[in-house]
Interface confidence: low
């Protein structure tokens, strides 16, 4: 009933709760002397479904047959309308439309841990839209029964609050769930199980790892489990990996030796437990243990390269470079690099530990046969040394690779190609492709990059430390025993016209011609490899086209003579620079008048 219904009643037949698709009869009747004040014939009873009129009738009562009501609750309200007054609410009723419960499916029960309680879940089936009561019943040996009810409209879980014990692990228990509402009832199929079937162990806890003698090869994982656990499965992976390694163990008694861990790697470990070989279910995975394995002696050898620079008639500078070992080779934190320099004939040797750098420079005599050995050391030991004989890498002209070219290959890549040397190509043991940013001053501090290529390769894609709009000096070395030959080329991955022209800093007269000197364009304005400089000149105040002279670009060159100027004529001169993409704007303009010989 909706309110006090003082003026009348609303009755619903056959029931306020009906099956979907059923018809109901709704009657609204006024109580005596509750109609309109003067004329009862003027009583107009109106039936509303929610806020919508569905029927009306003049008199003391109204009958309405209603069909097609939707699932859920529908509100009907009866109102009285008299002449010259507002409608008055008489009474109302809610009708509940639903269905009988379906048979609960997939009843399954579980006890979490040996000390836990039995709880069951099931699938309710489609929503009844009605208040539905679920009763869960468990029967066990010796006619023991337990029962639990839940009256939640969405009930699909109940905990009995009882603990099954392992005294008779093979004893059978049967669970059944029954759903009841106003329109009917239905029971699940019974589910029969034993203690071993339904106890799901708690996940292992207190997980720890021990490395005997700080060695990764002697590693034991420890954990604690409930007393009846028979099986464990372990999973572990490096923290930066998505793939797990899995191990199944029986009767582990809370410990297991792991034999395949990598050194100096952070791992994540998890363990799960089970009570019986083929009964019951696995526990949840334990909380993760994260642990870093100890270091081991480095494996692998450093990739070492070098550069020689002439200082004077008796001395040369040797710069050694090496690449970091990969993480899997370093097997720990590299504390220092050990560099040994040895004169092979006299036996003099010098050893130095280098920390924080992957290069070393020293000055040695130009005479003698020199060799270096470089190794990497962590807390557990050193890698095998890489040995290199210092030789003149470009001495053997017949070993020089031919037709070296460098072409842009996509973003920040350069494809270097070459032809084998004229000398027996089969003598080549390996090629080394070296590249560094081109600096006009030949700066030895510029980082050096290199890669090694097998003797049958005639190309290499260089991508490490390659920037757009920067020119690189690229050398290809062919190595054979104690000999080497080399060829070089300039290359860039991306280029455009230079941003500025060279700055003329001086014009001097020499024997009837002039010498123009200029400052190099700053590297960041060259926008790639320069191919040419152009020197332009024209008579001052003349409208004629300027003359020009084009000079191939050479790193070291910053002056050039011009001998076609007329004496005692004032000229304006300027310069530009060109890359493969185009010509720069003008550099500064300078005026000059060639004096010539006096008559």
């Amino acid at each position: 009933k909706i309110d006090a219904c003082k003026r009348g009643d609303v009755t619903v037949k056959p029931s306020h709760v009906i099956l979907l698709g059923s018809t109901v009869n709704i009657t609204c009747s006024l109580k005596p002397r509750q109609g309109c004040f003067h004329y009862s014939r003027r009583n107009k009873l109106i039936l509303y479904k929610f806020d919508r009129r569905i029927n009306f009738h003049h008199g003391h009562s109204l009958n309405s047959q209603v069909t097609g009501l939707p699932l859920g609750t529908t509100l009907f309200v009866c109102k009285l309308a008299c002449i010259n007054s507002d409608e008055i609410q008489i009474c109302g009723a809610e009708i509940f439309v639903g269905v009988a419960p379906e048979q609960p499916q997939n009843l399954s029960c579980i006890q979490k841990g040996e000390q836990g309680t039995v709880a069951c879940t099931w699938e309710r089936g489609r929503d009844t839209h009605l208040y539905t009561e679920y009763t869960l019943q468990l029967s066990g040996p010796k006619n023991l029964t337990w029962q639990k009810q839940c009256k939640d409209i969405y009930c699909d879980y109940l905990d009995f609050g009882i603990n099954l014990t392992p005294e008779s692990p093979e004893s059978n228990f049967t669970a059944k769930v029954t759903a009841v509402n106003s329109l009917g009832s239905s029971s699940s199929l019974p589910s029969t199980f034993t203690f071993l079937d339904i106890v799901r162990p708690l996940p292992p806890w207190d997980i720890r790892i021990k490395f005997q003698k700080a060695s990764v090869s002697r590693c034991t994982l420890y954990w604690r489990d409930e007393g009846l656990v028979l099986l464990n499965r372990l999973r572990y992976r490096p923290s930066n990996s998505r793939l797990w390694n899995m191990v199944n163990v029986t009767k582990a008694k809370g410990r297991h030796d792991l034999l395949d861990l990598k050194p100096f790697t952070e791992y994540e470990f998890q363990i799960s437990s089970k009570l019986h070989l083929y009964k019951g279910s696995w526990s949840d995975w334990s909380e993760s243990l994260r642990a870093q394995t100890p270091e081991e002696e480095p494996t692998g050898m450093l990739d070492v390269w070098y550069m020689k620079r002439h200082i004077d008639y008796s001395r040369q500078q040797i710069s050694l470079f090496w690449k970091n070992l990969s993480v899997s080779e370093a097997r720990g934190k590299i504390l220092h690099y050990q560099v040994t320099l040895q004169e092979l004939t006299g036996g003099k040797a010098m050893t130095q530990n280098i920390t924080g750098h992957t290069s070393w420079t020293t000055v040695i005599p130009r005479t003698g046969n020199w060799a270096v050995a470089v190794s990497a050391a962590n807390s557990k030991g050193s890698s095998l040394p890489t040995r290199i004989n210092i030789m003149n890498l470009c001495e053997a002209g017949l070993l020089a690779p031919r037709q070296v070219s460098a072409n842009s290959e996509g973003m920040d890549n350069i494809l270097v190609t070459w032809q084998p040397p004229r000398k027996d190509p089969s003598a080549v043991q390996e090629y080394v492709v070296e590249w560094r940013e081109l600096h006009p001053g030949g700066d030895t501090q510029v980082p050096l990059n290199w890669l090694r290529s097998r003797p049958y390769n005639v190309s290499a894609l260089i991508s490490e430390n390659i920037k757009s709009y920067i020119c690189y000096e690229i050398r290809v070395y062919a190595l054979s025993g104690d000999q080497g030959g080399c060829s070089s080329i300039l290359g860039n991955s991306k280029h455009k016209a230079p941003l500025s022209g060279p700055h003329i800093n001086a014009i001097t007269e020499e024997k009837g011609s002039i010498l123009i000197s200029w400052n190099s364009i700053p590297v960041q304005e060259q926008m790639g490899c320069l191919l040419h400089y152009r020197i332009y000149w024209k008579e001052r105040d003349s409208n004629s086209q300027p003359q020009l002279c084009e000079i191939p670009y050479r790193v070291s060159q910053n002056s050039h003579p011009i001998n076609s100027l007329q004496p005692r004529v004032t000229y304006v001169l300027w310069m530009t620079a060109l890359t493969a993409a185009g010509e720069s704007s003008h550099g500064n303009e300078r005026e000059f008048c060639l004096q010539g010989k006096a008559n």
């Epitope: 207190d206 997980i207 720890r208 790892i209 021990k210 490395f211 700080a214 952070e266 909380e287 243990l289 994260r290 642990a291 870093q292 394995t293 100890p294 807390s379």
Partner: nanobody, 125 residues
Framework: EVQLVESGGGLVQPGGSLRLSCAVS????????IAWFRQTPGHEREGLSS????????FYADSVKGRFSISRDNAKNMVYLQMNSLKPEDTAVYTC??????????????????WGQGTQVTVSS
């Protein structure tokens, strides 16, 4: 012989900050963990945060995540616990503890063989 000595406790107002220090000596390898625990009368020790000395990896219990921060200074052999936004319920005796091996997690008190003497922290207005 391993020794741990705490300092830095005291009285602080709610919302205030405090930095506890743990001076560490005697460990013979880098494979060890220092953790901070706290205990109030009648309650078990609660693990708050730990740091692995080899690589400074850290762990925090949910109760202090975002408020407390653990750090180390290898040169001085010190481990610090910076405590911000302190609440009255943070009042306790704070103790640092140590153990060999590389396990990081919060850990239970019985897993730590080496303990300091503790320092009192009182949060009250």
């Amino acid at each position: 012989e391993v020794q741990l000595v705490e300092s830095g406790g005291g009285l602080v107002q709610p919302g205030g900050s405090l930095r506890l220090s743990c001076a560490v000596s005697g460990f013979t390898s880098d494979y060890y963990v220092i953790a901070w625990f706290r205990q109030t009368p009648g309650h078990e020790r609660e693990g708050l945060s730990s740091i692995r000395i080899g690589d400074s990896a850290t762990f925090y219990a949910d109760s202090v995540k975002g408020r407390f921060s653990i750090s180390r200074d290898n040169a001085k052999n010190m481990v610090y616990l910076q405590m911000n936004s302190l609440k009255p319920e943070d009042t306790a005796v704070y103790t640092c503890a140590g153990r060999y091996d590389t396990l990081l997690g919060g850990g239970r008190p019985r897993e730590f063989p080496y303990w300091g003497q503790g320092t009192q922290v009182t949060v009250s207005s």
